[in-house]
């Protein structure tokens, strides 16, 4: 019986080279969270947070992904290729699986910012 709801950060944007926090929150349920999986748009696993074993960051993302805050994930050194959907999957007892979606758009630094950075005083 799925009584809970997943709240996410929704559609977010961040600058290339910067970082972003991906956050999901499960509410309106007494269910116990046993594991949270974070997946990228191509279904590749970024990280798992297991209640027993703690965090596991997958090797391909070790340099750019930091666990937290909470059950969320911090994505660093963003590239244009990071644009796309991200999914959090909550494995809970006794409700089963809940899934949340976040869309991340990575933006190029604006021309104004770019030129300002190279202005000669």
């Amino acid at each position: 019986m799925m009584t809970g709801t997943i709240e996410t950060t929704g559609n977010i944007s961040a600058k290339k080279g910067g970082s972003v926090i991906l956050q999901c929150h499960l509410s309106s349920t007494m269910a116990q969270v046993t594991q949270v999986n974070w997946e990228q748009h191509d279904h590749s696993l970024l990280a798992i947070r297991n209640a027993e074993l703690g965090w596991h960051i997958y090797p391909a993302f070790k340099d750019r992904v930091a666990p937290g805050p909470g059950l969320g994930l911090t994505l660093q050194s963003l590239t244009m290729n990071d644009t796309g959907e991200y999914f959090c999957t909550y494995h809970t007892y006794p409700d089963g699986t809940y899934r949340g979606r976040i869309f991340l758009e990575v933006l190029e630094s604006s021309v104004a910012e770019h030129s300002a950075r190279f202005q000669i005083p």
Epitope: Q32, A51, E52, Y93, G96
Partner: antibody, heavy 119, light 108 residues
Amino acid sequence: QVQLVQSGSELKKPGASVKVSCKASGYTLTSHALNWVRQAPGQGLEWMGWINTNTGNPTYVQGFTGRFVFSLDTSVSTAYLQISSLKAEDTAVYYCARGYSSPPRMDVWGQGTTVTVSS
Amino acid sequence: EIVLTQSPGTLFLSPGERATLSCRASQSVSRNYLVWYQQKPGQAPRLLIYGASTRATGIPDRFSGSGSGTDFTLTIRRLEPEDFALYYCQQYGSSPFTFGQGTKLEIN
């Protein structure tokens, strides 16, 4: 290995209370939910409810409210079932079982505790 | 609440034969969250199948689960002497998470 070890059999008089313990080993008690299941003599299994071992929040099935209390002592990795104002119809084997997900199931069971209520 | 009806109540078979146990729900079990347990006299139940068709760790492949919606089946392909026991289904589709009344598998 992962196991749940329950306290021994109890013989109680009507009106008395009993506290059944369920000790978890081989895993962290607070990482998985803990269920209680009753089996009356010669009868089937009856799910009594469960306790969120992370928050300590219990959920009771209708028919197991009031006289039944689920609790935890995480310092000794133990869950408890307390039954007060015992009646003859409480005579049963009581099992604790770990809740696992996903999909949900009870994957590890205690050996059961027989509670006999008789005058 | 969802009522689970198991049939037959008792099944008489011989070792080597195939056993087919049925579990019928009074309403559809959400996401096929149906579980099968085995119980032997004087012992705790043992998890066999979850999610209607996934075998639990250490369960021999002669055990298989199938079905969806309201009709579920546990099949034991070639019965071994140790398979003669009680079998219960349980649903996690809707609280309270009810059990069936059980099917007793007896040696013919």
